[in-house]
Amino acid sequence: QRGPLPKPSLQALPSSLVPLEKPVTLRCQGPPGVDLYRLEKLSSSRYQDQAVLFIPAMKRHLAGRYRCSYQNGSLWSPPSDQLELVATGVFAKPSLSAQPGPAVSSGGDVTLQCQTRYGFDQFALYKEGDPAPYKNPERWYRASFPIITVTAAHSGTYRCYSFSSGDPYLWSAPSDPLELMVTGTSVTPSRLPTEPPSSVAEFSEATAELTVSFTNKVFTTETSRSITTSPKESDSPAGPARQYYTK
């Protein structure tokens, strides 16, 4: 064996956001000819010595962080990046609204607001087709996601989730979808990016608001929060490669 073993990848199919009672498969992928795989749930004593974990029906206790590694001969690989498996539908859905409204002129501003009756301090906003959510810590039962200088790329279907930082892997059901329509522009398909844009967020300490824009690169903000990305899942309808904020 020459050189260190490469770390494996760990993905959740079809998604790492799993509604309660729905199936999900965690798959660890290393190089060909692996002798043994080990897939473990962090912060628990649960592990299994195989590459695939099949969950026929998602349960609360299965939510959490997973990672895997493999053995070749007497050598163990470095662990995979952690995969966060989230159970959704644990709590009632929040409501998602657009201010001033869901129809926006190109170049204008719009704020998406996710609101819940419960005391959740975390919110995640998803745009259909994007690989990652925009998460927003907020203390007042509501999260604001301003989108400044709207472009045609912001058109689409949005949903939000609410959850608690005390139980970060147990999420609400998704809000009803909100269709954001950007008027006054026409974009030809050839000018659209070939991949869904990555999300970039700037966090405002003063207002605890997340400003969301779109770019083809992911970079960290200048504040003490950083964006980390788990490996992108490929092929089949894989779940989002989730991006999140850590102090």
Epitope: P14, P19, E21, K22, P23, T25, Q50, F54, P56, S236
Partner: antibody, heavy 119, light 107 residues
Framework: VTLKESGPGILQPSQTLSLTCSFS??????????VGWIRQPSGKGLEWLAH???????YYNTALKSRLTISKDTSNNQVFLKIASVDTADTATYYC????????????WGQGTTLTVSS | DIQMTQSPASLSASVGETVTITCRAS??????LAWYQQKQGKSPHLLVY???NLADGVPSRFSGSGSGTQFSLKINSLQPEDFGSYYC?????????FGGGTKLEIK
């Protein structure tokens, strides 16, 4: 892989139906393997009833849940289904089938056993 | 519960023709869908699993497509042995439900 269903053939209303699925060519102790029961009234469509996984997790048709019990005998390669207090609406052909998690499908089926509920 | 709506309910076609049967799920089921063929007096037989994958021994004239909520089974160049009933079934959380079936008859 083969599966074969057996049952009483005829029952009277309010009796309990006991079905047995005997299989070979696979083991229900193998990770990701399950066995399910499906029924089909004559000339009608298919209806999933229940299934059981290698780890003894059991799932039931919501509408029939209170009347159904599925169990397994791994060492003898058998799965059982009981349906309490049968009625004429339970007259059907009953099939058992193997489930493999990878394909999420019923990949092998038995030949079926016919039940007639009549007074 | 997830409803599976299959169409058409019946279909007449001639040997050599191409036919398509569709199945619509009432919510997103990703690729958790299988197609079965059933001939008169026989048990169902798996054709396609995970929406697009042909089961072992199934002729290549059969193909499955779709994901999410819209699925289809296509049979190219129909053969005499292809006539019978076809069912779709979802596996995305219980209860697993079947479509109502499509009866494919010889014209």
């Amino acid at each position: 892989v083969t599966l074969k269903e057996s049952g009483p053939g005829i029952l009277q209303p309010s009796q309990t139906l006991s079905l047995t699925c005997s299989f070979s060519g696979f083991s229900l102790s193998t990770y990701g393997i399950g066995v399910g029961w499906i029924r089909q009234p004559s000339g009608k469509g298919l209806e999933w009833l229940a299934h059981i996984w290698w780890d003894d997790n059991k799932y039931y048709n919501t509408a029939l849940k209170s009347r159904l019990t599925i169990s397994k005998d791994t060492s003898n390669n058998q799965v059982f289904l009981k349906i309490a207090s049968v009625d004429t609406a339970d007259t059907a052909t009953y099939y058992c089938a193997r489930i493999h998690y990878y394909g999420s499908s019923l990949d092998y089926w038995g030949q079926g056993t016919t039940l007639t509920v009549s007074s | 519960d997830i409803q599976m709506t299959q169409s058409p309910a019946s279909l007449s076609a001639s040997v050599g023709e191409t036919v398509t049967i569709t199945c619509r799920a009432s919510e997103n089921i990703y690729s958790y869908l299988a197609w079965y063929q059933q001939k008169q007096g026989k048990s169902p037989h798996l054709l396609v699993y995970a929406a697009t994958n042909l089961a072992d021994g199934v002729p290549s004239r059969f193909s499955g497509s779709g994901s999410g909520t819209q699925f289809s089974l296509k049979i190219n160049s129909l053969q005499p042995e292809d006539f019978g009933s076809y069912y779709c079934q979802h596996f995305y959380g219980t209860p697993w439900t079947f479509g109502g079936g499509t009866k494919l008859e010889i014209k």
